[in-house]
């Protein structure tokens, strides 16, 4: 299968690597701009320089390009608990991450939130917390896992999944309820 090429990719493929086809004259191949710069003016003719300008503060280009504008630097989302790992430069976007003992929960491909790694109280660590995954806990007897926290079986309602894990405890609770005082 041949991948579908957009008009821009088709035009670019006519020129050798590192060059792009002049938008007004398809017989001219202009040199692409280096990362950290953007296209101000196309080259006037073959073998002549493309007019590239450096990105202004707050913007960047991370690869060679013929973009008319630099890309805006990303901002770390404070309300998502993100912190800035490295600031934006003309040739690299801001890098955002999480604090120590936190993991990234991705809501979508590029949007993540920082959450604290579970400590597995009333349980043991089965798998340690990683950059993109919370700790996996195994609960002690008398506790069941609910949203990655070990909760006492006394909080297990009959309708919930925990009944299998907490069956002896539930029977005991039921037993004490049934045996009324005389």
């Amino acid at each position: 299968l041949v991948p579908h090429l957009g008009d821009r990719e088709k035009r670019d493929s006519v020129c050798p690597q590192g060059k792009y086809i002049h938008p007004q004259n398809n017989s001219i191949c202009c040199t692409k701009c280096h990362k950290g710069t953007y296209l101000y003016n196309d080259c006037p003719g073959p073998g002549q320089d493309t007019d590239c300008r450096e990105c202004e503060s707050g913007s960047f280009t991370a690869s060679e390009n013929h973009l008319r504008h630099c890309l805006s630097c990303s901002k770390c989302r404070k309300e998502m608990g993100q912190v800035e790992i490295s600031s934006c430069t003309v040739d690299r976007d801001t890098v955002c991450g999480c604090r120590k003992n936190q993991y990234r929960h991705y809501w979508s491909e590029n949007l993540f939130q920082c959450f604290n790694c579970s400590l597995c109280l009333n349980g043991t660590v089965h798998l340690s917390c990683q950059e993109k995954q919370n700790t996996v806990c195994t609960c002690h007897a008398g506790f069941f896992l609910r949203e990655n926290e070990c909760v006492s079986c006394s909080n297990c309602k009959k309708s919930l999944e925990c009944t299998k894990l907490c069956l002896p405890q539930i029977e005991n609770v039921k037993g004490t309820e049934d045996s009324g005082t005389t």
Partner: nanobody, 119 residues
Framework: QVQLQESGGGLVQAGGPLRLSCAAS????????MGWFRQAPGKEREFVAA????????YYADSVKGRFTISRDNAKNTVYLQMNSLKPEDTAVYYC????????????WGQGTQVTVSS
Amino acid sequence: QVQLQESGGGLVQAGGPLRLSCAASWRTFSSYAMGWFRQAPGKEREFVAAISWSGGSTYYADSVKGRFTISRDNAKNTVYLQMNSLKPEDTAVYYCAVLHEDLYEYDYWGQGTQVTVSS
């Protein structure tokens, strides 16, 4: 155009309950995780709670765990925030947001709904 409309805010006494609603105007609502955030005067916007697209997973800020419950009704394109045992420090403007990078920009957020908890 994505539009979110929060409602249900108001003045409530400490210890009381309040239920916020967030209605979305687009059909693919059920494909996205949703979140509630709040902003108190002079403070930065902070996360309150979030819910996965299906409603199967929920997440809460430590400050509201055990008191607030997030839920959703995909048939009604609505996400809810049930707030119990309210405290004066819960006073803020509450906003809902779509948790997807293409729709998360503040331009897509609603106007918010004011919650005031009196002591």
